[in-house]
């Protein structure tokens, strides 16, 4: 099968919706950055479609994306991170649609990890801690985190807490006794860089102690 688009193919292509969205991840692999794009319409026939980025690059004019199933991505050190790049969907040598995007405004941080919850009996609270790879990064260092927790039986009743540190204290009296809770965390850029929420961290599950009847306090687990 030829990679050329026949005229008929181009005419058909022009009827399609080639809307796409992208996100960048900075210093995702050492000093390498990544840029990931995908079509918003999952039914687009991507067989001969390619993505290309031009402008605001170091040493090169343009870079081509690699294709992995429905996802198009670049891993490179060559993003200037100043000014807008032109990202185009191409078939053959024809550009079907382009977007001018500043890669610093579409940053998706890496998901937080090592989420854990420790019960402090004396303080009657739970200390929630987690880690983020962004503490070691040169660019996207400042993040806002969204900690979400729920009682396991409450399907969609999530309580959200926004914080800029990686430590949160949950008061025991705010939680139901003798209940299983699920907690997770995600991050979003919060200073200079803009963009999207990261993926959620893996969930952590913890149980609250029962109430000690004589003191009115919960029993430790």
């Amino acid at each position: 099968e030829s990679g050329y688009a026949q005229n008929g193919d181009l005419e058909d292509a022009e009827l399609d919706d080639y809307s796409f969205s992208c996100y960048s991840q900075l210093e995702v692999n050492g000093s390498q950055h990544s840029l990931t794009c995908a079509f918003e319409d999952p039914d687009v026939n991507i067989t001969n479609l390619e993505f290309e980025i031009c402008g605001a690059l170091v040493e090169v004019k343009c870079l081509n994306f690699r294709k992995l199933q429905e996802i198009y991505f670049i891993e490179t050190k060559k993003f200037l991170l100043i000014g807008k790049s032109n990202i185009c969907v191409k078939v053959g040598e024809k550009s079907l649609t382009c977007k001018k995007i500043d890669l610093t405004t579409i940053v998706k941080p890496e998901a937080p990890f090592d989420l854990s919850v420790v019960y402090r009996e004396g303080a009657n609270d739970f200390v929630v801690t987690f880690n983020t790879s962004h503490l070691q990064k040169k660019y996207v260092k400042v993040l806002m985190h969204d900690v979400a927790y729920r009682q396991e039986k409450d399907e969609n009743k999530w309580t959200h807490v926004n914080l800029s540190s990686t430590k949160l204290t949950l008061l025991q009296r705010k939680l139901q006794p003798a209940a299983m809770y699920e907690i997770k965390v995600r991050s979003i850029p919060d200073h200079y860089f803009k963009g999207f929420w990261s993926e959620w961290s893996p969930s952590y599950y913890f149980r609250t102690p029962e109430i000690n009847n004589s003191s009115g306090e919960m029993d430790p687990i």
Epitope: E50, C62, R66, K67, K77
Partner: antibody, heavy 119, light 107 residues
Framework: QVQLQESGPGLVKPSETLSLTCTVS?????????WNWIRQPPGKGLEWIGY???????TYTPSLKSRVTISRDTSKNQFSLKLSSVTAADTAVYYC????????????WGQGTTVTVSS | DIQMLQSPSSLSASVGDRVTITCLAS??????LAWYQQKPGKAPKLLIY???RLADGVPSRFSGSGSGTMFTLTISSLQPEDFATYYC?????????FGGGTKVEIK
Amino acid sequence: QVQLQESGPGLVKPSETLSLTCTVSGYSVSTDYAWNWIRQPPGKGLEWIGYIFYSGSTTYTPSLKSRVTISRDTSKNQFSLKLSSVTAADTAVYYCARGGYDVNYFDYWGQGTTVTVSS
Amino acid sequence: DIQMLQSPSSLSASVGDRVTITCLASQTIGYWLAWYQQKPGKAPKLLIYAATRLADGVPSRFSGSGSGTMFTLTISSLQPEDFATYYCQQFFSYPWTFGGGTKVEIK
């Protein structure tokens, strides 16, 4: 201006190890790009051997992987090729070149060095 | 491995002729293709990258077209210095592979 220059012995005995060095000027091998070795047997086409990435990671062609090591010395701005257990089939002009990985080209090449495997 | 089938393996042409060399990839490689020119005793020289983009300092009589599996290098008006061997190369997947070459000779 980026320049690459291969060096090493022109004659290697069968079963021994071929060792070549590529000295780079005008660009640091630890700044960016992949740093490649390519060879061309007499009268034949080009064969990519492998690269060392600016970060130090390496990728080799599967057919030579068991015999190839590419390393670097950032203090001298050099990268090197070692090919063990050579035979006459390894007789070729060996080139070093910059590029690949996130770019689809080799833009700078060394002039090449001829290595003959013979007893 | 992705096979790069280059044709013809050799051709004879005159100064001023339009010359076309094709490269067929055994699977789709998008725009991950480069063309090189090699003269006897010299290293290859980059002509075209990303299938269609002209490398710096390369005369505009050279052009590249195609994407996916079928690629073409065209020399619009052959000059005396263009008699050489031409190679295509894919960077889409490891191992990176070259075509077998096309030798352009004087008729």
